[in-house]
């Protein structure tokens, strides 16, 4: 029961995690125009990894894509692309789990696969998380030292008495949603791997052992407690019991009052 | 069509207080900023403030803030300009102004103006 | 504060011909974000309120005849009318509206030679 909680929260967990990376890589304020302590503009700037958008006081605003690939700096390509592995594997690390989950039954799908695919689920919800938890720390490392080196320059002297003010940026709620979703891919991921370890079937099938008797062939059985003479038919040792030790879970197979608590 | 209606012309005593209306009419009065110019006589313009009549945001020129207050009544689709304890300088036309949107920040329709003047 | 300079104070111009406005700002008006600079141009005509001509350095407003132009970025910008009509005679205000507060040039009245 413990186990497929896990497994279903897990589930649950990653999959709010992966939304939240995919609306993080989507939206525009991953920086935002900073407004304090700066030459207050009625003009409002915030960016993407896509695109850059100015709000007017108005409310009127205008985004412009970035069409450009070469032209664009390379810490940009590298948070873009660690988003997109964050979301490639995220997604089909959901997929997996789909199938990996204890309420749903495939065919005849041994728990032994189930716990590879929950394993494997999970571990690619480590990495997704991960790859978004890195993308946005190096974007905000990037706008860290963008921030105080325009602090540093904030007034850039144009000759004479003409200046012009630099717009420094800041965290916008991009960063902070990125933050979250990928910590809760993680979280959700751990939380898989857990529950892997609740479906994998113990290895304590014992193996048929024969042990021969001075006089007579005889070979014991553990398990189907049968034994018969070693010559003939019998002398295959057949799968009398099946030793994969089979969880709690597995056992209440039928609905029972801990079901239902 | 969009028009911005203001008030009579006002005569005042040094020290007392002004209260300029401006009535809007023709587009979505609590959709559009609202702000304040003056042109003293013979004088250039000076951007007093703003006010978004949808909340009721106000942002002040720091020239006359503690002086100036912009109020709005939603339901008649009227902005106030209150301008306290009045100098000889503060003799000017008053004119309202909606910002347009889309349009750089830029005022699109004025009203008429409305003759401030501080006497004793 | 922003200071606008408008140059020069006064012009008199012959009907039909170019008439050229100058002004410039104390910092620049230009918005790297979207690349446009937030200089409105005004037109005032004696008695009447001023009138919206031109918004983002070169955007004509609706309505405002194609004799009138907008040029310039940063820090210095001019207004072009054309061939002069005499219903151009005016005073033309150039305004910042990019930085708080929002200001205002002094004006250049434009006559008729």
């Known amino acids: 029961m413990a186990v497929t909680a896990c497994q279903g929260l897990g589930f649950v967990v990653s999959l709010i995690g992966i939304a939240g990376i995919i609306a993080a890589t989507c939206m525009d304020q991953w920086s935002t125009q900073d407004l304090y302590n700066n030459p207050v503009t009625a003009v409002f700037n915030y960016q993407g990894l896509w695109r850059s958008c100015v709000r007017e006081s108005s409310g009127f605003t205008e985004c412009r894509g970035y069409f450009t690939l070469l032209g664009l700096p390379a810490m940009l390509q590298a948070v873009r692309a660690l988003m997109i592995v964050g979301i490639v594997l995220g997604a089909i690390g959901l997929l997996v789990s789909i199938f990996a989950l204890k309420c749903i039954r495939i065919g005849s799908m041994e728990d032994s696969a189930k716990a590879n695919m929950t394993l494997t689920s999970g571990i690619m919800f480590i990495v997704s998380g991960l790859c978004a938890i890195a993308g946005v720390s190096v974007f905000a490392n990037m706008l860290v030292t963008n921030f105080w080196m325009s602090t540093a320059n904030m007034y850039t002297g144009m000759g004479g008495m003409v200046q012009t003010v630099q717009t420094r940026y800041t965290f916008g709620a991009a960063l902070f949603v990125g933050w979250v979703a990928g910590g809760l891919t993680l979280i959700g991921g751990v939380m898989m791997c857990i529950a892997c370890r609740g479906l994998a079937p113990e290895e304590t099938n014992y193996k048929a052992v024969s042990y021969h008797a001075s006089g007579h062939s005889v070979a014991y059985k553990p398990g189907g407690f049968k034994a018969s003479t070693g010559f003939g038919s019998n002398t295959k040792n057949k799968k009398i019991y099946d030793g994969g030790a089979r969880t709690e879970d597995e056992v209440q197979s039928y609905p029972s009052k801990h079901d239902y608590v | 069509q969009v028009q911005l209606v203001q008030s009579g012309a006002e005569v005042k005593k040094p020290g007392a207080s002004v209260k300029v209306s401006c009535k809007a009419s023709g587009y979505i009065f609590t959709n559009y900023w609202i702000h304040w110019v003056r042109q003293a006589p013979g004088q250039g313009l000076e951007w007093m403030g703003r006010?978004?009549?949808?909340?009721?945001?106000?942002y002040y020129n720091e020239k006359f803030t503690g002086r100036v207050t912009m109020t709005r009544d939603t339901s008649t689709s009227t902005v106030y300009m209150e301008l306290s304890s009045l100098r000889s300088e503060d003799t000017a036309v008053y004119y309202c102004a909606r910002e347009g949107y889309g349009k750089g920040n830029s005022m699109d329709y004025w009203g008429q103006g409305t003759t401030v003047t501080v006497s004793s | 504060d922003i200071v606008m300079t408008q140059s020069p104070d006064s012009l008199a111009v012959s009907l039909g011909e170019r008439a050229t406005i100058n002004c410039k700002s104390s910092q620049s008006l230009l918005n790297a974000g979207n690349q446009k600079n937030y200089l409105t141009w005004y037109q005032q005509k004696p008695g009447q309120p001023p009138k919206l001509l031109i918004y983002?350095?070169?955007t004509r407003e609706s309505g405002v005849p194609d004799r009138f132009s907008g040029s310039g970025s940063g820090t210095d910008f001019t207004l072009t009318i054309s061939s002069l009509q005499a219903e151009d005679v005016a005073v033309y205000y150039c305004?910042?509206?990019?930085?708080?507060?929002?200001?205002f040039g002094g004006g250049t009245k434009l006559e008729i030679k």
């Open positions: 305004q910042n509206a990019y930085y708080y507060p929002y200001t």
């Open positions: 006010i978004y009549p949808g909340t009721g945001n106000t």
């Open positions: 983002w350095a070169s």
